[in-house]
């Protein structure tokens, strides 16, 4: 897949066996009721395939039509295939739904590469392995698309979980989660545990596997270890955050922190890679190469194009550095850091590897639209999208892939001054010139 496209993404089996979740190390102070505890019915409700997306089962219409829907925190439309397509096993048939209402309005969403277009309407929507509620939500019925649906991905639509500001055709189209919170008693918060397999999965393994959890309305203790650390949502459009420092194996990249957030930094479950602004990407790759200099890899590997293969079970994880992103904390002059391992940023690739080989793609790539903390980051962590308190929480995921020597980490606090200066202020432009997706 091209690393420049927002989709596809990746998922897979958890690193910890089901039922063997690691215990939490600490307790935080209790918060308002209904937001914490056990959400058994929602745990393990995500599935997916490496590089192609984490999806949740949803039902649409009356009688209910079941569809698999990609979970995407980098967009704000609920859009589903609504016409035959070679890559779709099933699609939303509006004419069969007694509760469908046509909004008599079209929607067109161009990506850097590819696009989808469709017709807007509303219908009744529920999530079988989610809260026991049904909501009337806006739905974009996709009638035409190009390079959007993915052959073999097993999802038929997309659930944009970001804010109305980036909804198409404009911010008057209420996103699904806003509708859910308005129409029910579900708290204005959701959390994601994306579980990378650490190894490629074939189609039958994917269908039988767990890809993680989307907890709607709360936080599940069993899905993380240690403490949750929160960073403010800078602006409610994408889930925008501020990165204040970057380290490779503990070595500061020493760049002006504005560069890390040029022109924004977002948390996006609909992107496979950790994507970095050009200058930051170049500095990071230089530093990663230096840290792993006992080996030399082909140029195409660092571009995310060529695969490097090792004999099965011999991948030298120890020669690759850990990567730490320091995020603005909730307290003035306080930050915390999230640290990922090569097990997150080297993505196992299916179809090419044999029983003799483990093959990987470098899953850090260059961006012209800012930093994107995609699945590469999210697979290390349990991520809480606390919309009610305008913040995003990170804790070490109970399912992240690691080895006996190193583990992903969320640590703090650290003293960091002038963090507000790290944010980049995007010049106001005509909204119609904004491009969905990435350059």
């Amino acid at each position: 897949t091209q690393h420049g496209i927002r989709l596809p993404l990746r998922s897979g089996l958890g690193g910890a066996p089901l039922g063997l979740r690691l215990p939490r190390e600490t307790d935080e102070e209790p918060e308002e009721p209904g937001r914490r505890g056990s959400f058994v019915e929602m745990v393990d409700n995500l599935r997916g395939k490496s590089g192609q997306g984490y999806y949740v089962e949803m039902t649409v219409g009356s009688p209910p039509q079941t569809l698999n829907i990609l979970v995407d925190t980098g967009s704000s439309n609920f859009a589903v295939g609504a016409a035959p397509h070679p890559f779709l096993h099933r699609y939303y048939q509006r004419q069969l739904s007694s509760t469908y209402r046509d909004l008599r309005k079209g929607v067109y969403v161009p990506y850097t590469q590819g696009k989808w277009e469709g017709e807007l309407g509303t219908d009744l929507v529920s999530i079988p392995h989610g809260p026991n509620v049904t909501v009337r939500a806006n739905i974009a019925a996709i009638t035409e698309s190009d390079k959007f649906f993915i052959n073999g991905s097993n999802w038929e639509g997309i659930l944009g979980l970001a804010y109305a500001e980036i909804a198409r055709p404009d911010d008057s189209l209420e996103p699904f989660f806003d509708s859910l919170v308005k129409q029910t008693h579900v708290p204005n918060l959701f959390s994601l545990q994306l579980c990378g397999a650490g190894f490629p999965l074939n189609q039958s393994e994917v269908l039988a596997s767990v890809g993680g959890s989307m907890i709607i309305g709360g936080i599940d203790h069993s899905l993380y270890t240690g403490s949750l650390w929160y960073t403010p949502i800078r602006r409610e459009w994408y889930y925008e955050v501020i990165i204040v420092r970057v380290e490779i194996n503990g070595q500061d990249l020493k760049m002006d922190c504005k560069e890390y957030n040029y022109d924004k930094s977002i948390v996006d479950s609909g992107t496979t890679n950790l994507r970095l602004p050009k200058k930051v990407f170049e500095a990071a790759v230089k530093s990663i190469k230096a840290a792993s200099s006992t080996e030399k890899f082909p140029d195409g590997f660092w571009l995310g194009e060529q695969l490097v293969c090792w004999q099965a079970g011999t991948t030298p994880w120890n020669i690759f550095p850990v990567i730490s992103l320091y995020l603005m904390g909730e307290v003035t002059n306080q930050s915390f850091r999230i640290t990922i391992l090569p097990q997150q940023y080297l993505r196992p690739v299916e179809d090419v590897a044999t029983s003799q080989d483990d093959c990987y793609k470098f899953a850090i790539s260059q961006s012209s639209t800012g930093t994107v903390m995609g699945a590469v980051i999210m697979e290390g962590f349990y991520v809480v999208f606390d919309r009610a308190r305008k913040r995003i929480g990170f804790a070490v995921s109970a399912c992240h892939v690691h080895d006996e020597f190193r583990t992903a980490a969320v640590e703090g606090p650290f003293v960091t001054l002038d963090m507000e200066d790290c944010g980049y202020n995007i010049p106001q432009t005509d909204e119609s010139t904004l491009m969905t997706g990435r350059a």
């Epitope: 082909p298 195409g300 060529q306 179809d351 080989d357």
Partner: antibody, heavy 120, light 108 residues
Framework: QLQLQESGPGLVKPSETLSLTCTVS??????????WGWIRQPPGKGLEWIGM???????WYNPSLKSRVTISVDTSKNQFSLKLSSVTAADTAVYYC????????????WGRGTLVTVSS | EIVLTQSPATLSLSPGERATLSCRAS??????LAWYQQKPGQAPRLLIY???KRATGIPARFSGSGSGTDFTLTISSLEPEDFAVYYC??????????FGGGTKVEIK
């Protein structure tokens, strides 16, 4: 201009170890831009990659030969070497040394090759 | 493992004719494919890399095309010195260990 030259015995007995050396002239083996590799070609057949080495000593081997192959580098002599143990008649081939360039991917410069026959 | 299949096994042509050699990968190798020429008693020589880039000193009559799974080496007008065996090699998966079986271009 850079040249590669293989050297070593042309005849090896079965079960013994085949040893070849490649001498690099007209350039340094310590360049960070290249790996240095071995490829072989049995008479009348196609090309088979054996393995390669970086000046730091990092090695990559063909899994089908890995248990029998050792590639080493001597930067002071601007040479790298191949050892293939427990040889059989199936190891009879022309052995080439080559430079791996163009983004550390392609064999962009080859030695002339040396025929090694395994026979008692 | 990615398998490279070259066709035809032998191509019989006359000098001045156009030669079209095919290399098919069992799955996509993007554009990470090379072509080598080997004359009798000589070492192979790199002709084309990254599917379409000519190596240093290679005449313009040699051209490569294709991406994904299907690749072509074209010799626009065969010279007497072009009669040889041609091999393709993929490096999409690295280290670079996969060669095709070869195509022999012989004088008709």
């Amino acid at each position: 201009q850079l040249q590669l030259q293989e050297s070593g015995p042309g005849l090896v007995k079965p079960s013994e170890t085949l040893s070849l050396t490649c001498t690099v002239s007209g350039g340094s083996i310590s360049s960070s831009s290249y790996y240095w590799g071995w490829i072989r070609q049995p008479p009348g057949k196609g090309l088979e990659w054996i393995g390669m080495i970086y000046y730091s000593g990092s090695t990559w081997y063909n899994p089908s030969l890995k248990s029998r192959v050792t590639i080493s580098v001597d930067t002071s002599k601007n040479q790298f070497s191949l050892k293939l143990s427990s040889v059989t008649a199936a190891d009879t081939a022309v052995y080439y040394c080559a430079r791996v360039g163009h983004g550390i991917s392609y064999f962009d410069l080859w030695g002339r090759g040396t025929l090694v026959t395994v026979s008692s | 493992e990615i398998v490279l299949t070259q066709s035809p096994a032998t191509l019989s042509l006359s000098p001045g004719e156009r030669a079209t050699l095919s290399c098919r990968a069992s799955q996509s190798v993007s554009s990470y494919l090379a072509w080598y020429q080997q004359k009798p008693g000589q070492a192979p020589r790199l002709l084309i890399y990254d599917a379409s880039k000519r190596a240093t000193g290679i005449p313009a009559r040699f051209s490569g095309s294709g991406s994904g799974t299907d690749f072509t080496l074209t010799i626009s007008s065969l010279e007497p010195e072009d009669f040889a065996v041609y091999y393709c090699q993929q490096v999409y998966t690295w280290p670079p260990r996969t060669f095709g079986g070869g195509t022999k271009v012989e004088i008709k």
